[in-house]
């Protein structure tokens, strides 16, 4: 079985999917579409690398700039380097800029819906 | 303003190879993904694959998978679609379209590829 | 593969009259999240390259006459000339860009009776 048939038998099990089980599904090959990912938990999909979500979406990554506006993928641009955004080839902008410092203080992320970023 | 210049028609013989290119310029090469539709002689559209100009990451219709390889020189902002192991089926026209985010926005004016004996 | 079912085939209609392109996906094209739609339109004259009309089922791509609207949701879509003029002659395309391989339908021909 291949990944994107494996995708399809797995897909409606998905939703409350943790953070681990995406990450090694990204390994898998699956090339999830857009549809299914903005469907995963935001908690789940935040803490995902530019690198995982190309792996998890496959060609599917493309979209991203098309729903840049609508969570998660919104909140998960938002936690990304810019410079790992841009190799994506999408012109997205709202990264971290190069230089800043992303400190994971927990209870004031929660209140700002953002990360707490230290200047260079 | 966005453009899209494709390299000209070719005539090649069943198991050769052919090697489209697409020139690009009015935007960001790297900021676009750029994709290949071919359309055989009075029939539909058939989507190839997409690559991503700025890692060079590319995807492929499994229908082409083992005989398509699209790459990109971000020097020259110019795609290329190459095509092996050519058949008389493979006569078509191939297009480079410029993404828009997922959809088609910007479209070449077309390559013809002739396959025959 | 996603497959898109166009109707019909050709289409004759009068100047100033109403075209109506109907076009079917194999399975749903909305992303119930954002309620995007993801399904594009495009025109192809004879002799030119396709031209993107409609993206998202019902988004009017910048420069399109405010003729050309499209609608429609999840499985069914529609694309409607309000008053068709003689430089819309052409082949009308609907593509799902939903999941890969991105797929096209067969295209509607319109022609003025």
């Known amino acids: 079985m291949n990944g994107s048939e494996y995708f399809v038998k797995i897909q409606s099990f998905l939703g409350g999917a943790p953070t681990e089980d995406l990450k090694a599904l990204s390994q898998q090959n699956v090339s999830m579409d857009l549809a299914t990912f903005m469907k995963l938990r935001t908690d789940a999909v935040l803490p995902l690398t530019v690198a995982e979500v190309q792996k998890l979406l496959g060609p599917h990554v493309e979209g991203l700039k098309a729903e840049e506006r609508h969570r998660p993928v919104r909140d998960w641009i938002l936690r990304q380097r810019q410079d790992d955004l841009d190799t994506l080839g999408l012109g997205l902008q709202g990264g971290i800029p190069n230089g800043y410092l992303v400190l994971d203080l927990s209870m004031q992320e929660a209140l700002s819906g953002t990360p707490c970023l230290l200047g260079p | 303003e966005v453009q899209l210049v494709q390299s000209g028609a070719e005539v090649k013989k069943p198991g050769a190879s052919v090697k489209v290119s697409c020139k690009a310029s009015g935007y960001t090469f790297t900021n676009y993904w750029m994709h290949w539709v071919r359309q055989a002689p009075g029939q539909g559209l058939e989507w190839m694959g997409n690559i991503n100009p700025s890692s060079g990451d590319s995807y492929y219709n499994e229908r082409f998978m083992s005989r398509v390889t699209m790459t990109v020189d971000k020097s020259t902002s110019t795609a290329y679609m190459e095509l092996s192991s050519l058949r008389s089926e493979d006569t078509a026209v191939y297009y480079c379209?410029?993404?828009?985010?997922?959809?088609?926005?910007?479209w070449g004016p077309g390559t013809l590829v002739t396959v025959s004996s | 593969d996603i497959v898109m079912t166009q109707s019909p085939d050709s289409l004759a209609v009068s100047l100033g009259e109403r075209a109506t392109i109907n076009c079917k996906s194999s399975?749903?094209?909305?992303?119930?999240?954002?309620?995007?739609?993801?399904l594009a339109w495009y025109q192809q004259k004879p002799g030119q390259s396709p031209k993107l009309l409609i993206y998202?089922?019902?988004t009017r791509e910048s420069g399109v006459p405010d003729r050309f609207s499209g609608s429609g949701s999840g499985t069914d879509f529609t694309l409607t000339i309000s008053s068709l003029q003689a430089e819309d002659v052409a082949v009308y395309y609907c593509?799902?860009?939903?999941?890969?391989?991105?797929?096209f339908g067969g295209g509607t021909k319109v022609e003025i009776k």
């Open positions: 399975q749903t094209l909305l992303n119930s999240v954002s309620q995007n739609n993801y």
């Open positions: 998202f089922a019902s």
């Open positions: 379209a410029r993404s828009g985010g997922l959809w088609l926005a910007f």
């Open positions: 593509q799902q860009h939903y999941r890969t391989p991105y797929t």
